[in-house]
């Protein structure tokens, strides 16, 4: 391209400027003459002859068009423009290439696992409707009024009943298709299901046949009952339940084959339906044999109940269980039906709540676990199903036997209560990816302690340190036990402690971590590449 051509092009560009942006220079009327006829907004300036005007005109107001074109067309400026243009495009391409390299080299976001609803939070068992609702109540209609409370606990499912017709030890008077009239009608049940659905609470129905009798499956192996469970599954699935529980399956002959058959019916209806089996067994081999033939079965057992309340033993039980079950989804509880207080002293309740909510799997609680309900503290109450303490009037039998801090009402008003801790843990469990489906790594932290990390990809990570002992301990966190993907930082923020007195949100140095007796800490720290 010649210099002349370049100048011509510039001239055309300048000529096409909007009139109000054209140079106004007294020394030259060229701009106006080139612009053609007078246009709105332009003022023709008469060149003055007198000196004052000349002086004003002599005052510098920028280059004239001719001068500008002349300078712009000079080889230096042409080269500069080309260099800048080239630099711009090179820079642009460099940034593009950089972005591509970053995207290609950046670690892939880990694909989220398929999550069923029971993977997202805790299950809440109400085995005895009458005990749960208290004196003079105890039916399905009344339970509907307690759904807001269950919502406040952020539990994902309600394991209800059994509520079917059952006369103690009498097969002929056991009907898995009929609701015991003491609990209400089928219409009451349908209404409960609708209300629960609106509150995003799933309903799991316990179909343990002889729940009022000595043996849950009757004194001899009654095949007719097990056969009819199939029909009951179909009936209640059609009614809209989200799953089933059957307990004491160690008393059921050929339990594995029956469970497989029931699982097929449940999953055949929808993959979103759950089957929970309960056993009193705490033997890992027995538990594994039940799980072997039944994928997706949630099994509650007494496995953790013999943890002996020591950190090392609990760590050993948990890691053995997780190693043995592989990538199978687990559930965590201390038994298939009983309260935590049946197994634990009061000072360990908070610790176990923290553990159950942060282990990989579904935590399963019984009504009252959230407030530390203890049958032993309520004279005359059955161990399996003591009356739920909603407020101080819930147990009128012995005046003064119940204090405010034992009740739902009292604990709801106390941010340091067991109930408040339960709510906070339940909330964290249902929203943090690392707790929802994160990897689990247990590691050494010293005698008496059980500690582990939960982490998922580049999400916030959680460190749990539990002191089962009744003396204060210093945690020597052995990060060498951990894989590179789960390394420990120097400091982590305290999310919560099971004991009062610690400042939440404060960073704690992990090398100098000291735990109070029976204290559990939940700490969080960010992912570091």
């Amino acid at each position: 391209m010649s210099q002349d051509t370049e100048v011509d092009m510039k001239e055309v560009e300048l000529n096409e400027l909007e009139p109000e942006k054209q140079p106004m220079n007294a020394a030259s009327g060229a701009a106006m003459s080139l612009a053609g006829a007078e246009k709105n907004g332009l003022v023709k300036i008469k060149v003055a002859e007198d000196e004052a005007e000349a002086a004003a005109a002599a005052k510098f107001t920028g280059l004239s068009k001719e001068e500008l074109l002349k300078v712009a067309g000079s080889p230096g400026w042409v080269r500069t423009r080309w260099a800048l243009l080239l630099l711009f495009w090179l820079g642009w391409l460099g940034m593009l290439a950089g972005a591509v390299v970053i995207i290609v080299r950046a670690p892939r976001c880990r694909e989220l696992p398929a999550q069923k609803w029971w993977h997202t939070g805790a299950l809440y068992r109400i085995g005895d409707l009458q005990a749960f609702q208290g004196h003079g109540a105890g039916n399905l209609a009344g339970l509907k009024g307690r759904l807001d409370y269950l919502s406040s606990l952020k539990v994902k499912g309600l394991v209800l009943g059994p509520i079917h017709k059952n006369q103690k030890d009498d097969v002929a008077q056991t009907d898995l298709l009929q609701i015991d009239p003491n609990f209400g009608s089928k219409e009451d049940f349908d209404s409960l299901l609708q209300s629960a659905k609106k509150k995003s609470i799933r309903v799991i129905l316990d179909l343990t046949p002889n729940y009022r009798g000595e043996n849950s499956w009757f004194s001899t192996q009654v095949d007719t009952v097990a056969t009819k469970v199939k029909d009951a599954l179909e009936f209640w699935l059609q009614a809209g339940v989200d799953g089933f529980q059957v307990r004491d399956i160690e008393n059921l002959k050929d339990a594995s084959s029956f469970l497989a058959e029931w699982q097929n019916i449940t999953k055949g209806f929808s993959e979103d339906r759950l089957l929970i089996a309960g056993t009193n067994s705490s033997d890992l081999q027995q538990i594994l044999s039940l799980l072997e033939s039944n994928k997706d079965l949630l099994l509650t057992s007494s496995y953790l109940s013999d943890s002996g309340s020591t950190g090392e033993h609990t760590k050993s039980l948990v890691t053995q269980y997780l190693n043995a079950t592989g990538n199978r989804w687990c559930s965590w509880s201390l038994s298939q039906a009983r309260l935590l207080t049946s197994f634990l002293p009061a000072q360990l309740l908070r610790l176990y709540q923290l553990m159950l909510f942060t282990l990989p799997g579904t935590p399963v609680f019984s009504y009252g676990d959230e407030i530390g309900l203890d049958a032993a503290a309520l004279p005359g109450q059955p161990m399996e199903a003591p009356v739920m303490l909603w407020d101080e009037s819930s147990f009128p039998d012995i005046p003064g036997a119940v204090s405010a801090n034992m009740t739902v009402k009292g604990q709801s008003e106390d941010p340091g209560s067991l109930l408040s801790l339960f709510r906070r843990l339940s909330d964290q469990r249902s929203k943090e990816r690392s707790l929802l489906h994160g990897d689990f790594h247990a590691f050494s932290a010293g005698p008496g302690l059980f500690s582990y990390i939960r982490h998922w990809d580049q999400n916030e990570r959680f460190l749990v340190v539990l002191n089962f002992g009744d003396v204060g301990l210093s945690a020597g966190l052995q990060a060498s036990d951990l894989p590179a993907s789960a390394s420990l930082p120097a400091k982590a923020d305290l999310l919560l402690s099971t004991q009062p007195g610690r400042e939440e949100g404060s960073p704690l140095e992990l090398e100098r971590l000291k735990l109070e007796p029976h204290e559990g800490l939940l700490l969080r720290f960010p992912y570091a590449a």
Partner: antibody, heavy 115, light 107 residues
Amino acid sequence: QVQLQESGPGLVKPSETLSLTCTVSGGSISSSYWSWIRQPPGKGLEWIGYIYNSGSTNYNPSLKSRVTISVDTSKNQFSLKLSSVTAADTAVYYCARETYYFDYWGQGTLVTVSS
Amino acid sequence: DIVMTQSQKFMSTSVGDRVSVTCKASQNVGINVAWYQKKPGQPPKALIYSAAYRYSGVPDRFTGSGSGTDFTLTISNVQSEDLAEYFCQQYNSYPLTFGSGTKLEIK
């Protein structure tokens, strides 16, 4: 009070299919088990099978290959079909409600298999 | 299949007597046994379930007993209307099975 009434042909030719219907009145056919039982002349009672309102069935293995029990909840009826009949299928056929044992029975209908 | 054996095909008794009809299961059926009364031209009528529980409306002269494999239906103070055939039935396992029946005759 639940009442049951069997209906169907009293005579069926060998190799054909025996069809009977039981109408339930005084109660809903839903949420219960409904069975067919037969008694050949001079012999004991034999359970044929049951149906439950979802359509789930359970048959006596000795007859399973030939039996179909179905339900029509809209009509409050359930039916029995027994294929490839022989003279040995001649019996009084009863429909009954099963609660493990049988608490309500129909009057029974005699079906003779003969050419 | 569980076989229910009623060894006595016929039993003879007099009005006002006490009579016991027996039934033996080929394997343990717990208490999952029912007894029926059947009169000619009529359907069977439930008398006893769960080995010992009287069905509603059944006179208290009918009593059931036994568990495991041996079961007994006892009619005390036999009445003329008790002339009928009596069947036992197990409901411990499918297929449900009946005894062959015991006919009660009045002397």
